[in-house]
Interface confidence: low
């Protein structure tokens, strides 16, 4: 187990022409926050696929108001690191998505509005326990600078967080064949070669494949407690035979999972499913608070200011789940009447009505063209007591006042899939391509806008890509 840590250094206009407009204004002050999504391996999955290694949301940054006439500066950032805990081994190779979100603080009905400002993605090699690697990524006219590392949580050590350290049994040296655990020199590296299933609490090994029991435990996997009360000839602590044994409890007996976690047996031992706010092998670690950014997709975290109180995620429209991690398909409720086409734009539902119908849900039957005007060069077409506008290219809607589907122009290059989004569109790139419009080919060696660090990790230097 361990933690992936991301430090955002700056987010602002990239070099070169076409500096982006500031995302905030005097009329609409806003603040930024970031979301990181991690996936194992050098995956080429779409942005919508699950963050199998984990995800995290930053705190909100300071409120920012654009100075009139001034170019967009580097924007004020949230304090602190984004931390993504991982339970299992660190995979060594991973893919990341870092999203920069804007929270508008104007007089929105129903609270703040969230919109995605930029999304960068990449694929990297990274050894746990190594130094901070630095990176620069561009998304359109924006540039994001950040550092990242993976570190193991004790007792795990090593480049994959798979070696374990244990306190020394003797003050002077480690057991046979075991090394001191750098950098914890007062601890010893625990062997990884015991028999599969050997109890980590009550068993140990000095040779590969064996499972020797600590005093008071027995059985092939040292999971059976020794009963001494009715013993005539008690056997030594390493005995795997019967003699003075009582049937041992199953791994879930007595429920080893703390804090209301539920226990399920596994081939090796047990697994705890933890309630919200707790994690760890036995759900013993509390302390997931709003500061940890547990709410995804712009969810607003409430409560949970201290580790003992639970947090609640208030999800923006279109998302649900205890961490706002699930997208709601609100169109499945068929809210658009009269054959209207339903569009879920994230922050709202939009119905695109058939000719002759109008209204938020296409509930109104329309008159003919009398007194009707079609905007943006559209022409009114009568028929059957209804009117419709035949709109010029690039416009749509009842009166041609709406811009057409942003994906209609096929803006995603190289076979990327386009998704209509409430801030415009998002491209999910085909394997081998990346960028806001999938315009950049990924380098053949698996690098994206910057090269992946080779095995052994190097601090890939971004300067040469400026």
């Amino acid at each position: 187990a361990g933690v992936f840590e991301l430090q955002i250094h700056s987010f602002g206009p990239g070099p070169g022409p076409g500096a982006p407009r500031s995302p905030c204004s005097a009329r609409l002050p806003c603040r930024l926050f970031f979301r990181v999504c991690l996936k194992p391996g050098l995956s080429e999955e779409a942005a919508e696929s699950p963050c199998a290694l984990g995800a995290a949301l930053s705190a909100r940054g300071p409120v920012y108001t654009e100075q009139p006439g001034a170019p967009a500066p580097d924007l004020p950032l949230p304090d602190g690191l984004l931390q993504v805990p991982f339970r299992d081994a660190w995979p060594g190779t991973f893919s990341f998505i870092i999203e920069t979100w804007r929270e508008e603080l104007g007089d929105q009905i129903g609270g703040p509005a969230w919109s995605l400002l930029a999304r960068v993605a990449g694929r990297r090699r990274l050894a746990a326990g190594g130094p901070w690697a630095r990176d620069i990524q561009r998304a359109g006219a924006w540039e994001l600078r950040f550092s990242y590392r993976a570190r193991c949580e004790p007792p795990a050590v090593g480049t994959a967080c798979t070696r374990l350290c244990r306190p020394r049994s003797a003050p002077s040296r480690c057991g046979p064949g075991l090394r001191p655990c750098a950098p914890l020199e007062d601890e010893c590296e625990a062997p990884l070669v015991c028999r599969a299933g050997c109890s980590p609490e009550h068993g140990f090994c000095e040779q590969p494949g064996e499972c020797r029991c600590l005093e008071g435990w027995t059985g092939p996997l040292c999971t059976v407690p020794v009963s001494t009360s009715s013993c005539l000839s008690p056997r030594g602590p390493s005995s795997a035979t019967t003699g003075c044994l009582v049937p041992g409890p199953g791994p879930c007996d007595g429920n080893p999972c703390a804090n209301g976690g539920s226990c399920s047996e596994t081939p090796r031992s047990f697994e705890c499913t933890c309630p919200r706010g707790f994690y760890g092998l036995r759900c013993e670690v509390s302390g997931v608070t709003c500061a940890d950014g547990p709410c995804f997709n712009g969810g607003l975290c409430v409560g949970g200011a201290d580790p003992d109180s639970a947090y609640i995620c208030h999800c923006p429209p279109g998302f649900q789940g205890s961490n706002c991690e699930k997208r709601v398909d609100r169109c499945s409720l068929q809210p658009c009447r009269n054959g209207g086409l339903c569009l879920d734009l994230g922050h709202a539902l939009r119905c695109r009505c058939r000719a002759g119908f109008a209204g938020p849900r296409c509930e109104h039957d329309l008159d003919d063209c009398a007194g009707r005007a079609c905007a943006n060069g559209g022409t009114c077409v009568e028929g059957g007591g209804a009117h419709r506008c035949s709109c010029a290219l690039g416009f749509g809607g009842r009166d041609c006042r709406e811009r057409a589907d942003p994906c209609a122009a096929r803006p995603c290059a190289h076979g990327g899939r386009c998704y209509a989004h409430f801030s415009g569109l998002v491209c999910a790139c085909a394997p081998g391509y990346m960028g806001a419009r999938c315009e950049f080919p990924v380098h053949p060696d698996g690098a994206s806008a910057l090269p992946a660090a080779p095995p052994g990790l190097r601090p890939g230097d971004p300067q040469r890509y400026l």
Epitope: Q7, H9, G80, L81, D135, D461, R464, L466
Partner: antibody, heavy 122, light 107 residues
């Protein structure tokens, strides 16, 4: 203009610790990595580690010094500190702080402090 | 760690001459190499970053070249103030390392 001003010379006994300061001015302190480099008398340059002042826990240390060096920062005074413990005579050197060239990235060092001579002698 | 070997250790030239300093890495460091100048009693000064990128305020007579493992710093026409020690530095892998230096002295 960018300036890095270091604390004065120190004389320490073996086994003691020394804490050298580096006060930055003329730029946004929290945005640039600060590196520490040392130079023993008549010798070359040796990289000790670096710190990102925007987050005090964001540090990289040379494995050679990892168990003895600690880098910290105080954003209220725009000062970075390098503490070296368990001093030995071979730690006698001039210790430099230096700022790296670009915000959040790059490893070349374009602005340097004047250096602090640390002498370890019994 | 990556070892940087600078040669020659000492180079004796006269003002107006061309100086060529070499830095060889024990393994490929791509273009993650920088050059510094250091005068007695002073801190080092960055001359060239990323093999060949110039630094503002550094005279145009300083230039860099090379790739992979072999790199060169060239001073096209030596001025009296150029006599100093020159170090290369790699930032391709941890720990960051410096070369042993080349002392450029007046002949």
């Amino acid at each position: 203009q960018v300036q890095l001003v270091q604390s004065g010379a120190e004389v320490k006994k073996p086994g003691a610790s020394v804490k050298v300061s580096c006060k930055a001015s003329g730029y946004t302190f929290i945005s640039y990595w600060i590196t520490w480099v040392r130079q023993a008398p008549g010798q070359g340059l040796e990289w000790m580690g670096d710190i990102y002042p925007g987050s005090g826990s964001t540090t990289n240390y040379n494995e050679k010094f990892k168990s003895r060096v600690t880098m910290t920062r105080d954003t209220s005074t725009s000062t970075v500190y390098m503490e070296l413990s368990s001093l030995r005579s071979e730690d006698t050197a001039v210790y430099y702080c230096a700022r790296e060239t670009t915000v959040g990235g790059a490893y070349a060092m374009d602005y340097w402090g004047q250096g602090t001579l640390v002498t370890v002698s019994s | 760690e990556i070892v940087l070997t600078q040669s020659p250790a000492t180079l004796s030239l006269s003002p107006g001459e061309r100086a060529t300093l070499s830095c060889r890495a024990s393994q490929s460091i791509n273009n993650n190499l920088h050059w510094y100048q250091q005068k007695p009693g002073q801190a080092p000064r960055l001359l060239i970053k990323y093999v060949s990128q110039s630094i503002s305020g550094i005279p145009a007579r300083f230039s860099g070249s090379g790739s992979g493992t072999d790199f060169t710093l060239t001073i096209s026409s030596l001025e009296p103030e150029d006599f100093a020690v020159y170090y290369c530095q790699q930032t391709n892998s941890w720990p960051l390392t410096f070369g042993g230096g080349t002392k450029l002295e007046i002949k």
